[in-house]
Interface confidence: low
């Protein structure tokens, strides 16, 4: 297709003619002006169809063969001829034509996206065709190979699209070119019929990737760096397949000083020094291929940016507690840039900077720098520090923002007792929240081991962390290696900038948490009356571990204690527990004896079953209430007794057995169940008692006796009783005895109201005792019956009974008191009535 | 005899006042751990406040914490719950119930007193 | 909080049937579970303690069994004073008591 014309991007003369003339008229591209502008009025591609001053007599039924012109080749390659031997027939005023010449430009290009081919038609303004209605057509060929042959396409073989010109003066041709043919040769003639004349251009050959017109650069801005520079920054189209060079061009208007500047760069921003207060910047770009042909694209939307009286930059700064950071400030005030010199700085309008934080950078521009910097305190909805740029003693009201965070955020990690996973926590309640910012985990894991200080690497990864109901974020390593570091901190994103907190480094293999210690057992054991507590090591972590058992009665709250175990090959520990009778709950737990990791949960629990660990230690303490008459020989006597406390039984008491002994029957047993009365005839002259508690292990071996004797019956050794109401809860019942040669082994006091039908009450207590405090509820205006019974060995003996209280007289207390009691007849843990002890108990 | 009786129930306003009793006789009220208990048609049985026999240690349900209190006078052997702030949810009939403390059961309940919360 | 699920949570039986009812824990409680019985105006009234242990002064046709978190009531004759709502409730993790929402047993 060397007969094709090749289209660059840059303008061309087109020359058409009537059939024989000559060449001798026709301009070269080369005497063309490149200072030509196109439709835009900038540099493009353009293609002129140019006939002035060149001689016609008859334009009917004639087509112009228009023909690219260069001093090497004379020859024009003909668009194949879809006419089809039509003729036009010319309307157009011939002396018209021949004083103004028929121009047309066109102008060719790839669109931003990549999709359509463009070539727009205009008629120039000294067109004699302007007024006739234009037909254009343009026909291509996108070749399937492209051989070395001098022929053009076969006929029939170009397509051809209408083009629209729905404007007189411009017709718009689209090409739609696959994206796989970008770098092809596109092949297309243009055919323009206007007032009956056709204007046929050559053969003209394009790659269209050459030809790309992108679209505008987007997102222009602008904005003071922290250094004080105006930055604009914009981003490059999209979808174009190559980099591109942009054309800037922006003003500046002050008070002061008017500049303007057009420069080329390659990158998407632009820094333009010497940025002055109280400015107007305006600002448009343009791109192109970088490194290959192509076409300007049309110039972004203007963007105008206007500086404050007072810059500061940068005009916020993020920064952790314990950092150094500086603020800058230039300051404009009534047209005038103030001296740095003059320039005072405030904090919050409250404190002054001292003078020594100040730096000058220049004659304008004044710095102040902060070090070891506290965190920010939140003031109100304010979460930062104002800083104040001052001209002496006149503050502007813009200032610059300090954001000041302790970054100071712990990570703790666990592994699981299956060692699978690695388990990191951390909280921001330590951390000032600020709107905007983000926060990340990121890590990086070394092969082995931490290292000893722990540092931020340039490359790490981010890990999801998830926030908890408890405010704390979790994050799950899964895969882990046990033995690698991992090397972790907490990233603050925000758009001021981000910030780190201390890293820390974690090795899997040193915070692993055991599972807990299962079959998980506790006893107590029979006989020796001692906890047994046993348990099974969890299977990881191989390590050595230790144990730590915590035991405690079962119920309420429970009062836990602890024990230790460091062997580690311990399975169980018996431990002494005060009640053996008592549900205990157990749980164990473990931890690697060498101190690293952590504690594993507590086992689930283990509770012990009450079971009897030895026969009842003694049988129950009982009474008796002899019902009938008593000058029969024949009584119902009933025995009464209370339950077995646990402590007793040992740990249970299943039932009761009653033992008789008499001269006449000898012995025999019965078998009461777990009744606490029992009920028998006493016919004979003695009668002894004995009541045994069995529990599942055997029956009691100390027990109570008592005989019931006729002839005891009447020993009368208690030669006085008194009682004395110390106050309605407490009674004092004191005795005095006779000799006697009987062996006396301890006391029955009975009591009883006389005003009600309600139960009697009984204690046995030591025979060595002389005086008791009988603790119950007493109404004062109700009658009490006392009975003091002596039990001998031989049986019980004659109660002295007392149906009243002794004179309620102080003075006859404390003299009874004194006689009746004296410090020889005090026993156990009973004292001498004394002045004091009748007035404590009188007035509490 | 051993028992319970409480009183203290009757229709009252969303955000008004009540305090339940619970008279206890026959048995030493001290040594016992003493819950209240109500029931409501939808809900069944519920735990609503405990007072061990420590006297100090007391617990509430999480949805009445802050406006009930759980009190006794073991001089007259009296249970208390004043309840405050009350809401159509806290009608109920409330028992008085007495824990036996091996295995953690209710071996003595009142006869129970009605609060009904209504405007 | 231990959750306690029991099932079914109505029934209709006739005299002299055999009856069970179940009782599902959330978490294991051991044997630390309790039966009662209640009546219409009536406070509740305990059964069976510890998960098998008969409460003194109810009839042996009761029993209870089950440990962890799956637990067995079962009136092994059903008599006509049965008729009633029955609770379960665990004392395993305390002081929040809690109780199942009931089975009512009727009369079929």
């Known amino acids: 297709f060397n007969l094709s014309y090749p289209i660059t991007p840059w303008r061309f003369k087109l020359s058409c003619m009537p059939p024989n003339s000559t060449y001798d008229y026709f301009l070269l591209p080369a005497g063309l002006s490149k200072n030509t502008s196109n439709l835009n009025g900038h540099y493009e591609t353009a293609v002129e169809f140019n006939s002035s001053d060149t001689h016609f007599s008859n334009l009917s039924k004639t087509t112009f063969h228009c023909c690219f012109r260069s001093e090497q080749d004379r020859n024009c390659s003909l668009c194949a001829d879809n006419i089809e031997g039509k003729t036009f027939v010319s309307t157009v005023n011939s002396s018209v034509f021949q004083q103004m010449g028929a121009n047309w430009n066109i102008q060719c290009w790839l669109k931003g996206d990549l999709k359509l081919f463009i070539c727009y038609v205009e008629s120039l303004f000294k067109n004699p065709f302007k007024n006739y209605k234009h037909k254009v057509h343009l026909l291509y060929v996108l070749p399937e190979v492209l051989e070395d042959s001098p022929l053009v396409p076969q006929k029939g073989s170009f397509q051809m699209v209408h083009c629209n010109c729905s404007v007189h003066e411009r017709c718009e041709c689209l090409v739609p070119v696959p994206t796989a043919k970008l770098n092809d040769t596109l092949l297309m003639c243009l055919k323009i019929t206007s007032g009956g004349v056709i204007f046929q251009s050559p053969l003209m050959s394009v790659q269209p990737i050459n030809m790309v017109k992108p679209d505008p650069p987007l997102g222009l801005r602008m904005e003071i760096t922290d250094d004080g520079n105006l930055k604009i920054s914009w981003s490059s189209p999209p979808l174009v397949p190559f980099p591109l060079q942009y054309e800037v061009k922006y003003s500046e208007n002050s008070t002061t000083v008017i500049r303007e500047a057009d420069k080329i760069v390659s990158a998407t921003s632009l820094l333009v020094d010497g940025i002055l207060p109280g400015s107007s910047y305006e600002v448009q770009v343009r791109g192109k291929r970088l490194d290959g042909p192509g076409i300007w694209s049309d110039w972004s939307t203007p963007h105008v940016f206007t500086t404050q009286d007072v810059i500061y930059f940068p005009p916020k700064i993020l920064t952790s507690v314990g950092s150094n950071v500086s603020f800058h400030c230039i300051y404009k005030n009534e047209n005038k840039i103030v001296s740095s010199k003059k320039i005072v700085w405030w904090m919050n309008l409250a404190e002054k900077i001292p003078q020594s934080q100040y730096d000058v950078v220049s004659d304008h521009v004044s710095k102040v720098t902060f070090f070891n910097l506290n965190e920010t305190k939140p003031r109100g909805k304010f979460t930062y520090d104002a800083v104040y740029c001052c001209n002496e003693h006149e503050c502007h009201h813009r200032y610059a923002e300090l954001y000041v965070i302790d970054v100071n955020i712990n990570i703790s990690c666990e592994t699981d007792g299956h060692l699978t996973k690695m388990t990191c926590r951390w909280s921001t309640n330590t951390i000032q929240s600020l709107a905007g910012s983000t926060l990340q985990l990121r890590y990086r894991r070394s092969s082995l081991y931490c290292f000893d200080i722990p540092s931020i690497h340039p490359i790490s990864k981010p890990k999801d962390c998830y926030l908890q109901s408890d405010g704390f974020y979790e994050c799950v390593f899964q895969p882990i290696f046990l033995l690698s570091g991992y090397t972790m901190w907490i990233r603050i994103n925000h758009p001021l900038g981000s910030l780190d907190s201390p890293p820390t480094c974690v090795l899997p293999d040193s915070v692993v948490k055991p599972l807990p210690p299962s079959s998980v057992k506790a006893e107590i054991i029979k006989n020796i009356g001692l906890l047994k507590i046993s348990w099974e090591k969890p299977v990881f972590p191989e390590n050595n571990l230790q144990f730590q058992i915590r035991y405690g009665l079962s119920g309420k709250e429970i009062q836990w204690k602890m024990y230790d175990v460091y062997d580690a090959k311990s399975k169980s520990v018996s431990l002494p527990v005060p009640d053996f009778c008592a549900v205990y709950a157990v749980q164990v737990r473990c931890k690697r004896s060498d101190g690293l990791g952590l504690w594993s949960n507590w086992s689930n629990p283990a509770y012990t079953v009450v079971m009897d660990i030895k026969v009842p230690m003694r049988g129950p303490e009982f009474w008796r209430i002899i019902n009938g008459d008593t000058m029969k020989k024949e009584k119902n006597v009933t025995l009464l007794w209370k339950p077995l406390m646990k402590n007793d039984s040992l740990c249970s008491v299943q039932r009761y057995v009653i033992n008789h002994h008499t001269s006449c029957n000898g012995t025999w047993s019965e078998d009461v169940g777990n009744h606490t009365k029992f009920t028998f005839l006493w016919t004979e002259q003695a009668h002894t008692v004995t009541v045994l508690a069995i529990n599942s292990i055997g029956a009691s071996v100390a027990n109570f006796n008592l005989t019931f004797s006729w002839p005891m019956s009447k020993v009368n050794i208690v030669q006085s009783l008194s009682a004395y109401p110390l106050n309605s809860s407490c009674v004092i019942l004191s005795w005095i005895l006779s000799p006697s040669d009987y062996k006396l082994m301890y006391f029955i006091i009975e009591w009883k109201n006389l005003n009600e039908d309600g139960e009697i009450k009984w204690l046995r207590i030591s025979s060595s005792v002389k005086k008791y405090y009988i603790h119950d509820h007493f109404i004062p205006i109700e009658k009490y019956q006392f009975s003091l019974y002596p039990i001998f060995m031989e049986g019980v003996g004659k109660p002295k009974i007392i149906n009243s209280f002794a004179q309620d007289n102080t003075e006859k207390h404390q003299n009874d008191e004194q006689k009746l009691i004296s410090e020889e007849d005090l026993g156990g843990e009973q004292k001498l009535i004394s002045e004091e002890d009748l007035h404590h108990h009188h007035h509490h | 005899q051993v028992q319970l009786v409480e009183s203290g129930g009757s229709v009252v306003q969303p955000g008004r006042s009540l305090r339940l009793s619970c008279a206890a006789s026959?048995?030493?009220?001290?040594?016992?751990?003493m819950y209240w208990v109500r029931q409501t048609p939808g809900k069944g049985l519920e735990w609503v406040a405990v007072l061990y026999s420590d006297g100090s240690n007391k617990y509430y349900i999480d949805s009445v914490k802050g406006r009930f209190t759980i009190s006794r006078d073991t001089s007259t052997n009296t249970l208390y719950l004043q309840m405050s702030s009350l809401r159509a949810d806290d009608s109920a009939l409330y028992y008085c119930?007495?824990?036996?403390?091996?295995?953690?059961?209710?071996?003595?309940w009142g006869r129970g007193t009605l609060v009904t919360v209504s405007s | 909080d231990i959750q306690m699920t029991q099932s079914p949570s109505s029934l209709s039986a006739s005299v002299g049937d055999r009856v069970t009812i179940t009782c599902r824990a959330s978490?294991?409680?051991?044997?630390?579970l309790n039966w009662y019985q209640q009546k219409p105006g009536k406070a509740p009234k305990l059964l069976i303690y510890a998960a098998s242990s008969l409460q003194s002064g109810v009839p042996s046709r009761f029993s209870g069994s089950g440990s962890g978190t799956d637990f067995t009531l079962t009136i092994s004759s059903l008599q006509p004073e049965d008729f009633a709502t029955y609770y379960c409730?665990?004392?395993?993790?305390?002081?929040?008591?809690?109780f199942g929402q009931g089975t009512r047993l009727e009369i079929k």
């Open positions: 978490q294991s409680i051991s044997s630390y």
């Open positions: 409730q665990q004392s395993y993790s305390t002081p929040p008591i809690t």
């Open positions: 119930a007495r824990l036996n403390w091996d295995y953690w059961y209710f071996d003595l």
């Open positions: 026959g048995f030493t009220f001290s040594t016992y751990a």
